[in-house]
């Protein structure tokens, strides 16, 4: 089941999935002046079997002015700059996403890709939040959001993260070492069915994640 909405927006923060559940779609969007090749794929789809998942279809962009040149190679560094990048406080070694059954890695960029990626997440997907450069994280609980199915409708849990400017940190005394408080999750789950999957895998993965470089903005 696809999630009906985007993950919640947190001021001065970006989110990223460390791995994408099977069924996730990524639209093949091209930057201005370029378009998908004729009869080209509309999206990439994370799919596969129980032992291996990968992205089906390839996104290819070509100049709007020409008809026969197709591009799908990795961008050169100067082209890469066109993509929205939000660098976090310190880089990390990415989690080995291949070890997550039923998940795909971050799809590599394609040449002349649009600056913003449009993902379609599925129920059970977890995304992780971090403050943008120049802001620091004040945690009141997990800095993550999960797409859940409740009463037949999908919703994202609210990440417990506040991003504050460096100059403002003094107004939050005692928050130097962030801790998750027991009342950190505002939503209390009712007795109705909540369909989620892969929580344990995702949570274990989150434990290894301190900071990362988010290379794309997500819609």
């Amino acid at each position: 089941e696809l999630c009906d909405d985007d993950p919640p927006e947190i001021p001065h923060a970006t989110f990223k999935a460390m791995a994408y559940k099977e069924g996730t779609m990524l639209n093949c969007e091209c930057k201005r002046g370029f378009r998908r090749i004729k009869s080209g794929s509309l999206y990439m789809l994370c799919t596969g079997n129980s032992s291996h998942s990968s992205w089906d279809n390839q996104c290819q962009c070509t100049s709007s002015a020409t008809r026969n040149t197709t591009k799908q190679v990795t961008p050169q560094p100067e082209e890469q700059k066109e993509r929205k990048t939000t660098e976090m406080q310190s880089p990390m070694q990415p989690v080995d996403q291949a070890s997550l059954p039923g998940h795909c890695r971050e799809p590599p960029p394609w040449e002349n890709e649009a600056t913003e990626r449009i993902y379609h997440f599925v129920v059970g997907q977890m995304v992780y939040y971090q403050c943008v450069q120049g802001y620091r994280a004040l945690h009141r609980g997990p800095a993550e959001s999960v797409c859940k199915m409740t009463h037949g409708k999908t919703r994202w849990t609210q990440p417990q993260l506040i991003c504050t400017g460096e100059m403002e940190t003094s107004q939050f005394p005692g928050e130097e070492k962030p801790q998750a408080s027991p009342e950190g999750r505002p939503e209390s789950e009712t007795s109705c069915l909540v369909t989620t999957t892969d929580f344990q895998i995702q949570t274990e993965m989150a434990a290894t994640m301190e900071t990362s470089i988010f290379t794309t903005e997500y819609q």
Partner: antibody, heavy 117, light 104 residues
Framework: QVQLVQSGAEVKKPGASVKVSCKAS????????MHWVRQPPGQCLEWMGA????????SYSQKFEGRVTITADTSASTAYMELSSLRSEDTAVYYC??????????WGQGTTVTVSS | EIVLTQSPDFQSVTPKEKVTITCRAS?????MQWYQQKPDQSPKRLIY???KSASGVPSRFSGSGSGTDYTLTINSLEAEDAATYYC???????FGCGTKLEIK
Amino acid sequence: QVQLVQSGAEVKKPGASVKVSCKASGYSFTRYWMHWVRQPPGQCLEWMGAIYPGNSDTSYSQKFEGRVTITADTSASTAYMELSSLRSEDTAVYYCSRDYGYYFDFWGQGTTVTVSS
Amino acid sequence: EIVLTQSPDFQSVTPKEKVTITCRASSSRSYMQWYQQKPDQSPKRLIYDTSKSASGVPSRFSGSGSGTDYTLTINSLEAEDAATYYCHQRSSYTFGCGTKLEIK
């Protein structure tokens, strides 16, 4: 529940245009690609094109490019397919269908378009 | 452009029979989808990713194949399976021309 309800049958003269609508309900209209597929009597299914209502991105089959225009009204959760310069071989049942990624999971009931002088 | 060629075009079969429909792609593909269309109805999804059954599809329907050759198999055919079956390629949105199954 998800439903795609299409407009009624049309009879058109050669050279005219036809605009078929597809009203979606029961899901978030802007987040799924919507496709148009046609089926001439006793013939194959033919993909015509698709639209992503979230940003009005479209893709058309080369066979129909220049003659087909697919649009979406997000406020009405309705997709439209307009085919111009009609000829007799455009007589067909036209379907809208929602793209679930793996497959087209929901289809409209079909709209019969007859082109006859 | 990819062309999907189905065979046979038409098959008349008796209930409980095993039916095999093939679909050949003009170039190698990673996955194939199959749809069922009954008279005066819209197509209905049956098999996706070559061998996965869509929800609610009876277990007698199965798919297999790789590269350019793909197969839809109906084990122990039932009267309600009288329909036209189409293979479909997701990345190019190409459909085969269908195999019509008639129940004797």
